[in-house]
């Protein structure tokens, strides 16, 4: 049977009808509407937008739309006591101060409530001391400083350039190195693409532009005061000293005009190699401290931000399924922004809005999806994925029993070159099949499929003729669904050409210059890339909610498990002597992967042959597919990261944005040669191999014939 027959509706109401209803002009209109004022989490403006979206989703035809509120820890600058950094002379006089705000973009000079640049959740403090330049503040940058260059960051203020890794990891690394403060800045090497003008004349970062962002190390905890449980009316809250993931030293972000003033005076050691040099006309000396003439001058930070428990609001819309209402496909993206949110998040929220409108139009014509679709407008994503995590904590029992899939919908664009997809291997075939049916929006690919342009521009490094699909990491609202609950997840957006553009993210990320005009003038004037992303995200939701057999292919998991096992074994084999000494074997893991591969193959054969008209057998097979992702969850979680429970994937311990495979084994092996107790360290490697092998074998058995 087709999915149309399954829900007794006319063939007119199929995927094509849904996709044809999506309109670029509507996405443009919605983006404009969502970006005229700031929508910072915890503010009245963002509450009003939540109510507006609730009202519009109801008008679009959803069965119900509710607000779900939580009282979570947020962070704001002190309005009367601004944050800044100064250079002070030997008498303590401030001879240079960084700017207190970004110059507003044209047309926005009179907008109120633009939050000045700050690092959310920085503690208060006024540390002063010598500066050390630490490159990107990655793990390997501190190894270079401490081990090779013998530079001690203890008691120093470090200055790090944004990029490469999540800013929270930078701060954690600086803390561990003993720093007493962190200055984050955007270097033109990373945030100014050659040959492009600064905003408002182009999409590059001007010297006064600054990236805001949180600096937490939550490791999936959600609200720092209520880890594991929803921050509801009767919540028990930890004291601030026991809060999860808060930084212990002051942190503040600046633009490259201000960074120039700090870096141009740097003395001490020269940069170790060219990879430590940015594009400013400064020596990129590491320090510590300023050069000769300025050696008596110090840097002083003035940070007065406050952490406050504040109410946030998610909007949750429901479109009830006709056949399996107790199976949930979720489309979610955040609504809160740092300032106007021209790209992050409103380019995503506008797409979600148009997807809801299209589904609502079909529903008004008598159609329903087979499974229930939940739509979410999350709050406080920028403050640590708080809205999505609290909602998932509140609804975890329903989600772990009923959650089929989660599709994320943050920024629709970070460039206009090609598609970028990160997802569970279960969704590879869904994404491939869908993109083969969609038209490419790319110049030079008229009349060609999206799959074709995507594969040409972003080829898979392993399989010729296929596009690159990346691992899920974190830094967005899918985290709780995938890493904690084990719900199959995916995300898609349009991206830049990573070959030619070496800058991190997009230049105006989290700055005041991320406006509607940025998108309309420079990134997507016709909104054709937004429309394509709407088709991909919406198409995935449609198929997941409407196909009779879930569009998951477990054989693709088998392929990647073998690849990941090969990779982690090769990493371990960098230590052959120790492996022999401590009798380390990956045989159990390779054996489990082999079993998984064989069982997945047999399951796929049964999936082709079974009687789809038998609703019990259909439900049984679909449940095996739905619960496969869940089978990779270890209830005990990863070491010291209890909310990262997926054994195959976790955010990298060195970069929250990146995904790591077999993270338990990877972390046990990381820098193992420096461990003081090798026997204990290799024992942990062996334990992690055991956990991984057991989990893969257990997951395989969920695909075996049930009796």
């Amino acid at each position: 049977k087709s999915s149309n027959e399954a829900t007794n509706i006319t063939p007119k109401h199929n995927m094509k009808a849904f996709l044809d209803e999506l309109k670029a002009e509507n996405i443009k209109k919605f983006l404009y509407n969502f970006t005229q004022i700031p929508h910072l989490a915890g503010t009245e403006q963002n509450f009003q937008l939540a109510k507006q979206i609730q009202s519009q989703w109801k008008e679009f035809g959803l069965d119900s739309v509710e607000l779900a509120h939580y009282d979570v820890l947020l962070s704001y600058p002190n309005k009367t006591h601004p944050n800044y950094i100064s250079i002070i002379n030997e008498d303590g006089n401030e001879i240079f101060n960084t700017s207190l705000f970004e110059p507003p973009p044209p047309g926005y000079e009179n907008v109120s409530d633009i939050v000045p640049p700050f690092s959310a959740f920085s503690p208060q403090g006024m540390p002063e001391g010598d500066l050390v330049y630490v490159n990107y503040a990655r793990t390997e940058d501190f190894f270079k400083l401490e081990r090779d260059m013998k530079i001690n960051c203890s008691g120093k203020i470090v200055i790090a350039r944004y990029g490469k890794v999540f800013r929270g990891n930078k701060v954690k690394n600086a803390q561990l190195a003993g720093a007493k403060g962190v200055i984050l800045y955007s270097d033109p090497a990373d945030y100014f693409a050659p040959g492009v003008k600064s905003y408002p004349d182009g999409w590059n970062l001007p010297g006064g532009g600054v990236q805001r962002g949180n600096i937490l190390n939550l490791n999936g905890a959600g609200d720092p005061l209520t880890p594991g449980y929803p921050a509801n009316e009767y919540a028990y809250r930890r004291g601030i000293a026991e809060a999860v993931g808060l930084p212990s030293i002051p942190v503040h972000p600046i633009g490259y005009y201000d960074a120039q003033k700090l870096l141009e005076k740097m003395g001490g050691s020269a940069p170790p190699d060219s990879s430590w040099r940015g594009s400013l006309k400064v020596p990129y000396n590491v320090g510590p401290g300023f050069t000769g003439n300025f050696s008596t001058q110090k840097v002083k930070m003035h940070i007065h931000s406050t952490n406050e428990v504040t109410r946030i609001y998610n909007v949750i819309g429901t479109l009830r399924g006709a056949v399996e209402p107790d199976r949930y496909v979720i489309l979610g993206g955040h609504r809160d922004s740092w300032v106007f949110g021209g790209i992050d998040p409103q380019s995503g929220a506008a797409v979600v809005h148009e997807i809801v409108r299209s589904f609502g139009t079909l529903k008004k014509e008598g159609w329903r999806p087979r499974r229930t679709i939940l739509f979410a407008s999350w709050d406080a994503e920028e403050f640590g994925l708080l809205g999505s995590t609290e909602w998932a904590e509140e609804n975890s029992r329903l989600l772990q029993e009923r959650g089929v899939a989660y599709i994320n919908a943050d920024s629709s664009i970070e460039g206009n070159y090609t598609l970028r997809v990160d997802c569970t291997p279960l969704m590879y075939s869904l994404v491939h099949n869908l993109t083969k049916e969609l038209k490419s929006p790319d110049e030079g690919f008229e009349g060609k499929s999206l799959y074709e342009s995507w594969t040409k521009k972003s080829p898979s490094p392993e399989f010729s003729g296929m596009p690159r699909i990346s691992k899920l990491g974190s830094g967005n609202d899918f985290e709780v669904f995938f890493q904690r609950l084990g719900i199959a997840s995916g995300r898609a957006r349009y991206t830049k050409n990573w070959e030619t553009n070496k800058f991190s993210g997009y230049p105006l990320y989290h700055s005041v210059y991320e406006t509607y005009e940025l998108v309309e003038k420079f990134y997507d004037p016709m909104f054709k890339y937004h429309l394509t992303v709407a088709q991909v995200r919406g198409g995935m939701v449609f198929e997941l909610a409407n196909s009779i057999v879930l569009p998951f292919d477990c054989r693709d998991y088998a392929v990647v498990l073998r690849k990941y096992a090969d990779k982690i074994y090769s990493i371990s084999m960098k230590h052959p002597q120790e492996m022999k000494t401590y009798s380390v074997s990956f045989d159990s893991l390779f054996s489990a992967v082999k079993n998984f591969t064989e069982i997945a193959s047999k399951f796929s054969e049964r999936l082709q042959d079974f009687d789809k008209s038998n609703p019990i057998v259909l439900r049984m097979m679909n449940d095996q597919l739905m619960f496969l992702e869940r089978a990779f969850i270890d209830p005990l979680g990863l070491p010291d990261r209890p909310f990262y429970r997926h054994v195959i994937y976790a955010p990298s311990s060195h970069n929250k944005y990146a995904g790591e495979s077999f993270p338990g084994i990877y972390d046990a092996l990381f820098d193992i040669e420096s461990k003081v107790d090798p026997s204990k360290a290799w024992g942990e490697v062996k334990r992690q191999i055991y956990v991984a092998a057991f989990t893969v074998q257990a997951a395989a058995e969920t695909l075996s014939e049930v009796a």
Partner: nanobody, 120 residues
Framework: QLQLQESGPGLVKPSETLSLTCTVS??????????WGWIRQSPGKGLEWLGS???????HYNPSLKSRVIISGDTSKNQFSLKLSSVTAADTAVYYC????????????RGQGTLVTVSS
């Protein structure tokens, strides 16, 4: 009794490719219970694993050297070979071919080793 014997030039110029072959007697490289690998030892350093071949063609490589190493096998001759490209003086070492149990670093048999010097 299993025996492994390395062969190849003892002197290689910088930036060139080092090529070595291992001939196995008394056992088959097709055996799927074992991996067939290359390891090296530089003066004053520990053993460094370069990579291994198994199942008559699948390979594992040291991530640090991955872009420079190719290991291939010839089951008809019961040989497997190593190619290490873009060599520098740091690649000067005694190179051994060895058998190890699948998915371990348990090298139960290895060749006597061949010294390869990288020098112009």
């Amino acid at each position: 009794q299993l025996q492994l014997q390395e062969s190849g030039p003892g002197l290689v110029k910088p930036s060139e490719t080092l090529s070595l072959t291992c001939t196995v007697s008394g056992g088959s490289i097709s055996s799927n219970s074992y991996y067939w690998g290359w390891i090296r030892q530089s003066p004053g350093k520990g053993l460094e694993w370069l990579g291994s071949i198994y199942d008559s063609g699948s390979t594992h490589y040291n991530p640090s050297l991955k872009s420079r190493v190719i290991i291939s096998g010839d089951t008809s001759k019961n040989q497997f070979s190593l190619k290490l490209s873009s060599v520098t003086a740091a690649d000067t070492a005694v190179y051994y071919c060895a058998r190890h149990k699948a998915a371990t670093a348990d090298f139960d048999y290895r060749g006597q080793g061949t010294l390869v010097t990288v020098s112009s």
